[in-house]
Interface confidence: medium
């Protein structure tokens, strides 16, 4: 999930060529995408950029979000972890159950007409009795979030009604303490578990990293990093990447990010995930969500 | 790692110091300037990464400049507007930021003398 | 702005002692701390980094520990050869601070 990643659109192709063989799940959302312009930015929206249909709001150059060498969770662990999908279950982004009728996401996550799976462990449609389905009635990415670029990468989408707490749903408070190096966290989304192949997992994937050093990040990206993100890692190859978008960075217990863009191919040494730095963001967060309650 | 020669320098003059590094690519590791006054502690002036960016303490900020050359393996401290204040050793330090070791290789030093 | 903060200004241990040496940070860092040795026309050499990782060639008699705001260097069956002045450096940011460095500790001994 890195900034200044090699050319991807290849990645893409052979995706959707696989797609349509096949051969893969549907996991990307592939309309009208166009192999030409390959771009050097990878946000980590993976999917939902990879094949935004003309005259959507996505991010052609945003596909870095995912778990690189983690493990499956446990069930019943995140039940604040979203999946945003397209027809007829295409996952392109995660999201986080922040209210009970609100889901934070990655701006660069944005689409106009999408579901929202809760309370599913597995990256298959199949039916899981914990399950939630809804429709995304309202968008709102933050007012700073522009492209290209990654600041105030950040959107709240209204929910088309609230959600049935149980083990499986319920949501997790926005922390507005802002994270210090060494902070150990977890990160968790249905991306693409190898890159630059491309290798979807069947159930949800869990992370630990830890809290990078302003420096370290800044020294990673040069002139790309400011306080609306922070850098996490692990030294030992492990990271976020494609498909992970949008989901939870949790740290002691309470939201502390979202997985916003990174290095291509993803958990390439030195080059950390980049993720959305939501304690700058509580005072928005709150009153958006009581100003369309 | 070295430093280019100091030298006598009189008020408001500006500057340049050159500091020359081998064994190692400025591709992969920054540099740290850091100065030191006669008798006083060591003093942060600011950091280049490997990747280019240049950063600076609050203090130095608005009159210093850090580049670098990664084919001639140099890396520059301009600092504008000299008082008897910056008369101090200047050091230049390879900065392992990747590798976590922090200033691990530092150069001998030079003296910069500010006086009229 | 980070602000290291180190005590003692000076100590004077005996050979053979043990001298502790505390930097604080005004916010958390992490394990982004390391600690020099400089002796006096000489140029600062790195003796630990990561908080508490031995540097390359540096006796085990030196030990760094601490995290977060508060850090301390130990070292133990004092030498002749370890009077110098001592500083730590914090490695958490390098933008906009007034000093990433402690004032530091001079260290004699007797």
């Known amino acids: 999930m890195a900034t200044a990643r090699p050319p991807w659109m290849w990645v893409l192709c052979a995706l959707i060529t696989a797609l349509l063989l096949g051969v893969t799940e549907h996991v990307l959302a592939n309309n009208d995408v166009s192999c030409d312009h390959p771009s050097n930015t990878v946000p980590s929206g993976s999917n939902q950029d990879l094949g935004a249909g003309a005259g959507e709001d996505a991010r052609s150059d945003d596909s870095s979000s995912r778990i690189i060498n983690g493990s499956d969770c446990d069930m019943h662990t995140q039940p604040w972890q979203a999946a945003l999908l397209l027809r007829p279950n295409q996952l392109y982004c995660g999201a986080v159950l922040v209210h009970p009728q609100w889901l934070l996401t990655a701006a660069h996550c944005r689409k106009k007409v999408f579901r929202v799976r809760l309370g599913h462990y597995s990256l298959s449609p199949v039916y899981e009795s914990g399950q939630q389905m809804f429709q995304g009635v309202k968008s709102i990415p933050h007012p700073g979030y522009s492209h290209p670029g990654h600041s105030n990468d950040l959107m709240l989408i209204k929910l088309n009604r609230r959600i049935r707490p149980t083990k499986d749903v319920r949501p997790i408070n926005v922390s507005s303490h802002c994270p210090s190096a060494g902070t150990k966290c977890l990160v968790s989304g249905w991306g693409t578990t190898k890159s630059p192949q491309v290798h979807f997992p069947k159930v949800l994937q869990c992370l630990n990293i830890s809290v990078l050093s302003q420096k370290r990040c800044e020294d990673a990206y040069p002139r790309q990093i400011d306080d609306t993100m922070f850098c996490a890692g692990d030294k030992a190859g492990r990271d976020s990447c494609q498909g992970d978008s949008g989901g939870p960075v949790v740290c002691n217990g309470s939201l502390q990010g979202l997985v916003s863009w990174g290095d291509y191919p993803c958990a390439r040494p030195n080059r950390p995930g980049v993720y959305t730095n939501l304690c700058k963001f509580t005072k928005w967060i709150q009153e958006t969500i009581q100003a369309n309650s | 790692v070295k430093e280019s020669e100091g030298g006598l320098f009189k008020p408001t003059d500006n500057l340049t110091l050159t500091c020359t590094v081998s064994g190692f690519s400025l591709s992969n590791y920054g540099v740290t300037w850091v100065r030191q006054a006669p008798g006083n502690g060591l003093e942060y002036i600011g950091f280049i990464g490997s990747g280019g960016s240049a950063y600076y303490a609050s203090w130095a900020k608005s009159r210093s400049t850090i580049t670098r050359n990664t084919n001639l393996n140099t890396v520059t401290l301009k600092m504008t507007s000299l008082t008897a204040a910056d008369t101090a050793t200047y050091f230049c330090?390879?900065?392992?930021?990747?590798?976590?070791?922090?200033?691990?290789?530092w150069g001998p030093g030079t003296l910069v003398t500010v006086s009229s | 702005n980070i602000v290291m903060t180190q005590t003692p200004a000076s100590v004077e241990v005996a050979v053979g002692g043990t001298v502790v040496i505390k930097c604080q940070a005004s916010q958390n860092i992490g394990d982004y701390l390391s600690w020099y040795q400089q002796k006096p026309g000489q140029r600062p050499k790195l003796l630990i980094y990561s908080a508490s990782t031995l540097a390359s060639g540096v006796p085990s008699r030196f030990k760094g520990s601490g995290s977060g705001t508060q850090f301390t260097l130990t070292i133990s069956d004092l030498e002749c050869a370890d009077a110098a002045t001592y500083y730590c450096?914090?490695?958490?940011?390098?933008?906009?601070?007034?000093?990433?460095f402690g004032g530091g500790t001079e260290v004699v001994v007797k």
């Open positions: 450096h914090q490695d958490y940011t390098s933008n906009d601070v007034e000093n990433t």
């Open positions: 330090a390879r900065d392992d930021v990747g590798g976590g070791k922090s200033l691990d290789i």
